[in-house]
């Protein structure tokens, strides 16, 4: 995803940030309520701009106040630690007017063995050490503070987890004599909750746990945990979600099958399997209950652990999800692709809606991307023409009027969003690609005549011809 | 001022052995992952082997594995090449090169040392 | 392993104009928003030298003329306006998992 180079170069060490002692409670906050766009639909640049100028007229212009900056935190616990021993943290920006609470959890892949991890430290390190983590970070996408570019959450209060414990967000084994590292994705999530409630947290209302490939599978194993957390410390009223972003992976079998002897080319159950082991990995406690001992790794699985969440969680997912194709080793690098190739990507797409069939909150567009939610063009991607923000506050609507249990969605405000067309961008909204060689764009004719895509073959099943399927698609229709 | 300065290099003859050596300065030697480069002469870069900064993982390309063997001392700020079997395809310029940790990129080399394998 | 393909082997760019040098991957070395790609220019009897890292930063000290770009399999060194100090050897190279590897080399001359 875009605007991530934030890490320092080398040699330009920042002094450590303050640890600082939890804020003392503000006045309770006052809840901030949910817009409904249902009634400016057809007119959202001018609403959004009436509520931009009423939002900065009403908030205190102060400078500070006015910074899009997230600060950084080093955990005051320090024995909650990245890979190399170095504290973990979260990233901050304080929304003291409202009672909600989005907890982000960053991706980065995972590494499964001392080699792996070895080679991830020396030239990956923010991954795995917060030696060098920059004072502050700019929040995108869904954390962003702007409204033009976060109609869903604006006004929320924003945290960013670094990802340091290449784990999946699922360890709980500390740096000792036999552990050259550190795994403690599980625990840094309780601790960051556990700081945040001297924070304001405490005052919530609804708390978000989202999260980008690896953080999107972190939500799908930890959601539930946060959920009894807070409970147990005595904050029941907090109503915890997820939303898992990019994290939704499937057991399938490998284009081409390869040994398993780094991150990229292993076979997801094998690097989940060994990964689990490694670093004392930890899944939901009910999803655990329905595998065998050693059989944990399933529960790495969306479709898997999915049934067994109590909260509610909104899933989001391409339907030709690059890093899905990477561990399968597919390698789209600008050739024409060959046919058993292509059937192999349509059926994935396939798949992958068929795991979702049962997920009543997902957004799942037919395009070949990786992440989306904090992208600063997030708002841009439709199916079936509503937008992921849009149906997250359909989702929010539809929990607020308790309609968890029901399975009729709200009139005019859908939540289960999955694409139905069979092929890699045919929709034309989706996110745009760009030829591997050349650099220049691709409309979406090109780019599927460039997959090897026979037009004839992808007309039919739509009852036209290539020319009409042709004209239509370079007309982004 | 980051300094990295190779030694060891010569003539040997096919068959024979020799260990390249690599010193390092003004930096945190125990910090970086180090990397040695090859260039055979009138050709291209070739990477050919890669420590941990803790000295725990060591990689090797496919064309000289079995016959070198990498290590360092992290208390004498120096990598270490041992190379046996010595073959004329051997002969080159040996680099020894730093890696960003922040990327993997070659920040810094060596001016390098030349073995030559010849009877 | 990621084999990264150079092209042109060799190329002669007339002073003030722009050279072009593209470097393809045979799998993606892209991964959580940066790409493993870095450039080197190497002169006769000299050491390489890091010009460009993580496919578009500028390494410190190293003229603002040279600009990398692309993403995923497929990147570019651009030079412009070229100077006639850049006569050199250009290699592109990926860290994105081991093995480490380079691009065979372009040979820029200055016309």
């Known amino acids: 995803s875009e605007g991530r180079k934030t890490w320092r170069r080398r040699g330009q060490q920042p002094p450590p940030p303050p640890r600082t002692e939890a804020a003392p409670a503000a006045g309770q906050p006052v809840e901030s309520f949910p817009l409904d766009f249902t009634a400016v639909e057809g007119n959202m640049d001018s609403f959004m701009a009436q509520v931009k100028s009423l939002a900065q007229s009403l908030y205190p212009c102060s400078a500070q106040q006015l910074n899009e900056d997230l600060r950084l935190h080093l955990l005051l616990n320090t024995s909650v630690t990245c890979n190399d021993g170095s504290p973990a943290g979260y990233y901050l920006k304080e929304s003291r007017g409202s009672r909600r609470w989005l907890l982000f959890l960053e991706g980065g892949w995972y590494c499964f063995n001392r080699e792996n991890c070895d080679s991830r430290y020396d030239t990956m390190r923010r991954l795995m050490s917060s030696r060098d983590w920059p004072r502050t970070r700019t929040g995108t996408g869904i954390l962003s503070s702007q409204p033009e570019e976060n109609p869903y959450w604006w006004n929320a209060n924003m945290v960013f987890i670094p990802y340091c414990s290449s784990d999946v967000w699922s360890g709980a084994s500390s740096k000792s004599e036999k552990n050259e590292y550190a795994f403690m994705g599980a625990l840094i999530i309780q601790e960051v909750v556990r700081e945040l409630l001297g924070r304001g947290l405490s005052g919530a209302k609804v708390l978000l746990l989202a999260g980008s490939s690896a953080g999107g599978t972190g939500v799908l194993l930890n959601v539930d945990r946060v959920a009894e957390q807070l409970e147990k410390l005595g904050y029941p009223a907090i109503q915890v979600r997820g939303l898992a972003d990019s994290g939704w992976f499937l057991d399938n079998k490998q284009y081409r099958h390869t040994d398993c002897v780094d991150t990229i080319t292993c076979a997801p159950t094998e690097a989940i399997r060994r990964g689990i082991r490694y670093w004392n990995g930890v899944v939901p406690e009910r999803c655990r209950r329905q595998f065998q001992e050693g059989e944990e790794w399933n529960c790495f699985f969306g479709y898997k652990v999915y049934p067994t969440l109590r909260c509610p969680v909104f899933v989001v997912q391409w339907l030709f999800d690059e890093a899905q194709l990477t561990v399968d080793n597919v390698h789209l690098t600008g050739q024409p692709v060959q046919e058993g190739l292509r059937l192999y990507i349509q059926n994935l797409g396939r798949e992958l809606r068929h795991t979702l069939k049962d997920v009543p909150a997902s957004f799942a567009p037919a395009c070949l991307s990786h992440e989306i939610i904090i992208r600063s063009h997030w708002t841009d991607v439709q199916v079936k023409g509503t937008s992921l923000p849009r149906a997250l506050h359909c989702w929010d609507r539809s929990l607020h009027d308790s309609h968890k249990a029901s399975k009729t969605p709200l009139k005019g405000c859908p939540v289960h969003l999955v694409d139905s067309c069979p092929w890699p961008h045919c929709n034309p909204s989706c996110p745009t690609v760009r030829d591997q060689f050349t650099g220049q764009e691709m409309n979406v004719a090109q780019f599927l005549m460039h997959m090897g895509f026979d037009m004839q073959t992808v007309a039919q099943p739509q009852g036209l011809e290539p020319s009409e399927l042709l004209g239509m698609l370079s007309n982004g229709s | 001022d980051v300094q990295l300065l190779e030694s060891g290099g010569g003539l040997v003859q096919p068959g024979g052995s020799r260990k390249l050596s690599c010193a390092a300065s003004?930096?945190?030697?125990?910090?970086?992952?180090m990397h040695w480069v090859r260039q055979a002469p009138e050709k291209g870069l070739e990477w050919v082997a890669y420590s941990s900064s803790g000295g725990t993982t060591v990689y090797y390309a496919d064309t000289v594995k079995g016959r070198l063997t990498l290590s360092r001392d992290n208390s004498k700020n120096t990598l270490f090449l041992e190379m046996t079997s010595l073959r004329s395809e051997d002969t080159a310029m040996y680099y020894c090169?730093?890696?960003?940790?922040?990327?993997?990129?070659?920040?810094?080399w060596g001016q390098g040392t030349s073995l030559t394998v010849s009877s | 392993d990621i084999v990264l393909t150079q092209s042109p082997a060799s190329l002669a760019v007339s002073l003030g104009q722009r050279a072009t040098i593209s470097c393809r991957a045979s799998?993606?070395?892209?991964?959580?928003?940066?790409?493993?790609i870095h450039w080197y220019q190497q002169k006769p009897g000299q050491p390489p030298k890091l010009l460009i890292y993580l496919a578009s930063d500028l390494e410190s000290g190293v003229p603002a003329r040279f600009s990398g770009s692309g993403s995923g399999a497929a990147f570019t060194l651009n030079i412009h306006p070229v100077e006639e100090e850049d006569a050199a050897t250009y290699y592109c190279h990926h860290s994105r998992e081991l093995p480490f590897t380079f691009g065979s080399g372009t040979k820029l001359e200055i016309k």
């Open positions: 003004g930096f945190t030697f125990s910090d970086f992952g």
């Open positions: 799998k993606s070395v892209s991964t959580s928003g940066y790409s493993y």
């Open positions: 090169a730093r890696a960003s940790y922040d990327g993997g990129y070659f920040d810094c």
